[in-house]
């Protein structure tokens, strides 16, 4: 008969730039040897070969050298595929094709996602505003996937649907920049909020602008930065937004722009003498030269590291000067937890077992929760440790000691408090005597 190949029913959701595991398993018969196994992963639609295992050997990746099997687990029936540095173009269906004597196949869907940045709000015109003036408020959010849903509302939470134009443009990586424009007639004052929703991650990014029509005070340069921290995934690029309002006749020769670390005052990047003075920060920073004349003093920080987390000050001097600090919050998603059981065979009700839940390379430190099959929290006899590697990313290991009942499911949930991302794993222990993993 046909070989039963099992894959998850739900799509695997993976963040751009992270690694994803496409799970696939089969039940090897007694006496099975890897020499009998023919394993092929391919794109479901085009049938393009992705990775294969044949004649007892891993035949390697046919997919930009970004795939890998789990060779130590193949003999136990684990034919899962690791896809590294996920890109938008990877989204779609992958077929796992297993042949021993019989053969079988199953397809697993990969859903790619990328969180949208906190929206930046711009106002046009942005000075000398009076009640009754018509203003254009632009809400921009960057580098997300898939396409966003955008909602506008006023200070009372009432949706604003008229006179809204939203455009979404994909860059070379397939990530979307969304720009939504609201045209509104000013009242005495008003708050306008823009919410950008990622439909896959169910992640909402929002910003608001409060407009009090009056003449802005003269004197110091008003430097504007986002109030909330900028959240950036490790390895991605982040934009630290900073803007000022240039006066009529302003020229870049007058501008002295300095970015520096708020605490240590270490120089990061500067613009003086009408030219970009370059990066003083490991050559990973850049300005937006074409936008400086319009008052956009934002800084692009490339290949974000954990060590970049903290406050950056944007210092603008024209005739007067002003400064403002923006916080960078670094984050990295935790991997799907792996579960191990000790002892893992000949288990009987009443035995005490140790279940270890391990999740890797996340930031910041995780929150770990255990629960049973009924969703009841398990808090007793839990020990959780978190260790940072050289890059500052945390590996979390949580150990639950429990006395077995007739059967039971034990779930571990690893939560990233910044990304509000939950990764969970569970183990079900049934029958007696029992073995883990369950044998065919």
């Amino acid at each position: 008969g046909a070989l039963e190949v099992q894959v998850p029913e739900d799509p695997v959701v993976a963040l751009v730039g992270t690694d994803a595991t496409l799970c696939c398993s089969f039940s090897p018969e007694p006496g099975f040897s890897l020499a009998q196994l023919n394993l092929i992963w391919q794109l479901t639609d085009t049938k393009q070969l992705v990775h294969s295992f044949a004649e007892g050997q891993d035949q390697g990746s046919a997919y930009a050298n970004r795939t890998a099997l789990f060779p130590d687990l193949l003999a136990q029936g684990n034919a899962s595929l690791r896809l590294q540095r996920v890109r938008v173009a990877d989204e779609g269906s992958f077929t796992c094709f297993v042949s021993i004597r019989d053969f079988g196949s199953a397809a697993v869907s990969l859903q790619v996602a990328a969180p949208y940045s906190k929206p930046s709000m711009t106002l046009e015109p942005n000075k000398d505003l009076r009640p009754g003036d018509t203003v254009t408020i632009t809400c921009s959010s960057y580098q997300g996937y898939p396409e966003a849903e955008v909602f506008w509302q006023d200070g009372q939470g009432v949706p604003l649907t008229g006179n809204v134009t939203t455009s979404q443009m994909a860059n070379e990586q397939g990530l979307f920049d969304v720009h939504s424009i609201l045209r509104v007639v000013l009242g005495a004052n008003g708050t306008y909020s823009c919410l950008v929703r990622n439909p896959v991650l169910q992640q909402d990014a929002h910003s608001s602008v409060t407009i009090t029509p009056q003449r802005s005070p003269t004197g110091a340069v008003e430097v504007q930065v986002p109030e909330d921290p900028v959240v950036a995934l490790v390895g991605t690029d982040a934009t630290l937004r900073c803007s000022f309002s240039p006066e009529p006749g302003f020229s870049l020769a007058q501008l002295n722009l300095i970015w520096q670390l708020t605490d240590t005052k270490q120089l990061v990047h500067s613009f003086t003498e009408g030219r970009d003075q370059g990066s003083a920060y490991a050559n990973r920073t850049a300005l937006f030269p074409d936008l400086l004349a319009q008052g956009n003093a934002s800084l692009r920080l490339q290949r974000v590291r954990v060590a970049d987390e903290g406050s950056f000050t944007c210092f603008v001097s024209i005739r007067d000067f002003g400064s403002a600090a923006v916080s960078l919050q670094v984050a990295a998603p935790y991997s799907k937890p792996s579960m191990t059981l000790e002892p893992n065979k000949d288990l009987r009700p009443g035995d005490t077992v140790t279940i270890t839940c391990s999740s890797y390379r996340g930031y910041p430190e995780a929150e770990v929760f255990w629960q049973d099959g009924q969703g009841v929290p398990l808090t007793g006899n839990v020990t959780t440790s978190q260790m940072a590697n050289e890059q500052g990313l945390f590996d979390v290991h949580s150990v639950l000691r429990v006395v077995l009942g007739a059967n039971g499911t034990y779930s571990c949930l690893v939560r990233n408090p910044v990304l509000q991302q939950d990764a969970h794993g569970s183990v079900t222990i049934t029958g007696q005597p029992m073995t883990f993993p369950p044998e065919a």
């Epitope: 005052k265 500067s270 490991a282």
Partner: antibody, heavy 120, light 110 residues
Framework: QVQLQQSGAEVEKPGASVEVSCRAS????????IHWVRQAPGQGLEWVGM????????TYAQKFQGRVTMTRDTSTSTVYMNLSSLRSEDTAVYFC?????????????WGQGTLVTVSS | QSVLTQPRSVSGSPGQSVTISCTGT?????????VSWYQQHPGKAPKLMIY???KRPSGVPDRFSGSKSGNTASLTISGLQAEDEADYYC??????????FGTGTKVTVL
């Protein structure tokens, strides 16, 4: 005319800290970078770091990271260099020098130098 | 941030020419046209003689000239005079807002 006036000689014990000041006059203080350069007895010049007086932003030579701190007081047009955890090899004349308005500019004006002696 | 290499000493008779070399890497001398040269008499602060490889500040005699080829910069003093006897240091921008000096060369007028 442009002048950089440095504080007087200092004698410190190993492990202590020293602060050297450099008062600028004759130009717009906040418009030009100030660099610190040191010279051990009978040795060559060694770049220590720089500060932008406008914002207080700093860059230090890797060798001095964690031990040197440069600050400025715009009200008195003075720059300060503090070097901590002193060792005997920090004995040197410390010069402040005015750079340009841009980075990568030469040092046209120099202070007279401050001799720091580290001795137990 | 390693130092730039200069010859320990050079000498010449009055009226002759001497050239001092300054060798770095593509990260400093070779990477930027920001090499400067300083003259230092004993017990005095350094004095700027050449900047941006070959430019002379006002007040510096035209006997002093600078050039650069690849990772090596050079200072030439033509028509050597007694007051030119001093230590000479090259300095180069090294990226990321840092500077690096040369080891120094003692010029002796015979």
């Amino acid at each position: 005319q442009v002048q950089l006036q440095q504080s007087g000689a200092e004698v410190e014990k190993p492990g202590a800290s020293v602060e050297v000041s450099c008062r600028a006059s004759g130009y717009t203080f906040t418009s030009y970078y100030i660099h610190w350069v040191r010279q051990a007895p009978g040795q060559g010049l060694e770049w220590v770091g720089m500060i932008t007086p406008l914002s207080g932003g700093t860059t230090y030579a890797q060798k001095f990271q964690g031990r040197v701190t440069m600050t400025r007081d715009t009200s008195t047009s003075t720059v300060y260099m503090n070097l901590s955890s002193l060792r005997s090899e920090d004995t040197a004349v410390y010069f402040c020098a005015r750079g340009g308005r841009a980075v990568a500019s030469s040092f046209e004006f120099w202070g007279q130098g401050t001799l720091v002696t580290v001795s137990s | 941030q390693s130092v730039l290499t200069q010859p320990r000493s050079v000498s010449g008779s009055p009226g002759q020419s001497v050239t001092i070399s300054c060798t770095g890497t593509s990260s400093d001398v070779g990477g930027y046209n920001y090499v400067s040269w300083y003259q230092q008499h004993p017990g005095k602060a350094p004095k700027l003689m050449i900047y941006d490889v070959s430019k002379r500040p006002s007040g510096v005699p035209d006997r002093f000239s600078g050039s650069k080829s690849g990772n090596t910069a050079s200072l030439t003093i033509s028509g050597l005079q007694a007051e030119d006897e001093a230590d000479y240091y090259c300095c180069s921008y090294a990226g990321s807002y840092t500077e690096v000096f040369g080891t120094g060369t003692k010029v002796t007028v015979l």
